[in-house]
């Protein structure tokens, strides 16, 4: 699906202090969805603010979040899942600011995990698998990830490259030897949903082998 | 009430270009994405593109790429459809319709006739 | 392109009656129990009218005799009286996949 290509426009600046950003992740928890909502600043005293949200929901008209320290969720099965939702935040009854939200289009998946790299000696190069849990999902099972490593000593030096699989190779001699790297992994929504990026999984780290002087190669670990 | 009121008929030759208008009211403009959809006579219809309001991002159907441009003026809750280098198959009612959501159409413009004849 | 292949291509029903509209797609327009399947009613003169979205639910203010159902590639709509304001051509449309194709129609008319 093409989406919408952006112009470069900015977007709306809210006229009030209470601006929020909102992800969706489906299936969760078995066959439950959530929505998490957040203010943008942190220095918003939310003490008697509440969240609601209205429309595009099976059963009832609106639903309200739970506070989870400085963050607002609701954990569900009564999402339809098409048609915008009107997501508002309210202190009693008064509405203080409403956004009018697909939740297909915020959906965030759960983190890559599991990632590991094996070093093939006979095939000079290294293979890198990782797992999700969306291979599990009915709704969100496309996804496009992000596999991004760097050199250790190579503070912001990251090489990324985009897949659609969970395995990646790596040749070797696309990789300095005898050097410590860092990888980690994380997935955005790629089939009809559109989001966020996961957060990043827990990074693994490797060592490339020694080149072996004779042959110009290098030793494996 | 939620409207969406287009400009009115338009007689062309064909290679010049049609510019049609459609002004929302009746709800907050940069909540839904706005489409335009092609009627030929006697024909059925057809998705021709979108655009969102809020960011100006459009959405166009590959067989009207290139000669379709949409843009939007939250100013005014006005969103246009351009349609260049026009020729006879152009000839068909066009209408704006908002986005409920992805992407269906719950609400159209009362439809703009546009006659492209030599 | 996904291609919707509406039949009947017109259908006469009895004032009362049950008239039903297929509507078949050339892949799945559904992800799990999500169906992007939609409705409309055009009568002539008039811009078409949203009836049913997401193969099932009905548009606020469209009476209830209509009703949509299926999956996958398989749709139907029912209208289960008819009255006389129903005369109309009836469309699908599918929003799974860009381009959002649109069936053939469905002229309905009073038997």
């Known amino acids: 699906e093409s989406g919408y290509a952006q112009n470069g426009d900015l977007e709306d600046a809210e006229l009030d202090d209470y601006s929020f950003s909102c992800y969706s992740q489906l299936e969760v928890n078995g066959s439950q969805h959530s929505l998490t909502c957040a203010f943008e600043d942190p220095d918003v005293n939310i003490t008697n603010l509440e969240f609601e949200i209205c429309g595009a929901l099976v059963e009832v008209k609106c639903l309200n979040f739970r506070k989870l320290q400085e963050i607002y969720f609701i954990e569900t099965k009564k999402f339809l899942l098409i048609g915008k939702s009107n997501i508002c935040v309210k202190v009693g009854e008064k509405s203080l600011t409403c956004k009018k939200i697909d939740l297909t289009t915020i959906v965030k998946p759960e983190a890559p995990f599991d990632l590991s790299v094996v070093y093939r000696e006979g095939a000079n190069d290294f293979v890198v698998t990782f797992n999700t849990s969306h291979l599990q999902k009915k709704y969100v099972k496309v996804l496009m990830h992000d596999v991004a490593y760097r050199q250790e000593k190579d503070e912001n030096k990251w090489t990324h490259v985009n897949l659609s699989s969970t395995k990646l190779t790596l040749l070797q001699r696309k990789l300095q030897p005898a050097a410590m790297y860092e990888i980690k992994v994380r997935s955005i929504p790629d089939h009809y949903f559109k989001g966020f990026w996961s957060e990043w999984s827990p990074s693994y780290y490797f060592r490339t082998p020694e080149i072996n002087n004779s042959s110009g190669e290098m030793d494996p670990i | 009430q939620v409207q969406l009121v287009q400009s009115g008929a338009e007689v062309k030759k064909p290679g010049a270009s049609v510019k049609v208008s459609c002004k929302a009211s009746?709800?907050?403009?940069?909540?839904?994405?706005l489409h335009w959809v092609k009627q030929a006579p006697g024909q059925g219809l057809e998705w021709i593109g979108g655009?969102?309001?809020?960011?100006?991002?459009?959405a166009y159907n590959q067989k009207f790429k290139g000669r379709v441009t949409m843009t939007s003026d939250r100013s005014t809750s006005t969103v246009y459809m351009e349609l260049s280098s026009l020729r006879s198959e152009d000839t068909a009612v066009y209408y704006c319709?908002?986005?409920?959501?992805?992407?269906?159409?719950?609400?159209w413009g009362q439809g703009t006739t546009v006659t492209v004849s030599s | 392109d996904i291609v919707l292949t509406q039949s009947p291509d017109s259908l006469a029903v009895s004032l009362g009656e049950r008239a039903t509209i297929n509507c078949r797609t050339s892949?799945?327009?559904?992800?799990?129990?999500?169906?992007?399947m939609h409705w409309y009613q055009q009568k002539p003169g008039q811009p078409p009218k949203l009836l049913i979205y997401?193969?099932?639910n009905l548009e606020s203010g469209v009476p209830d005799r209509f009703s949509g159902s299926g999956s996958e590639t398989d749709f139907t709509l029912t209208i289960s009286s008819l009255q006389a304001e129903d005369v109309a051509v009836y469309y699908c449309q599918q929003s799974i996949k860009d381009p959002y194709t649109f069936g053939g129609g469905t002229k309905v008319e009073i038997k």
């Open positions: 997401g193969a099932s």
């Open positions: 319709a908002r986005s409920g959501g992805r992407w269906y159409f719950d609400v």
């Open positions: 655009i969102d309001p809020k960011t100006g991002g459009t």
């Open positions: 009746g709800y907050r403009f940069t909540d839904y994405e």
């Open positions: 892949e799945s327009v559904s992800i799990h129990l999500l169906h992007l």
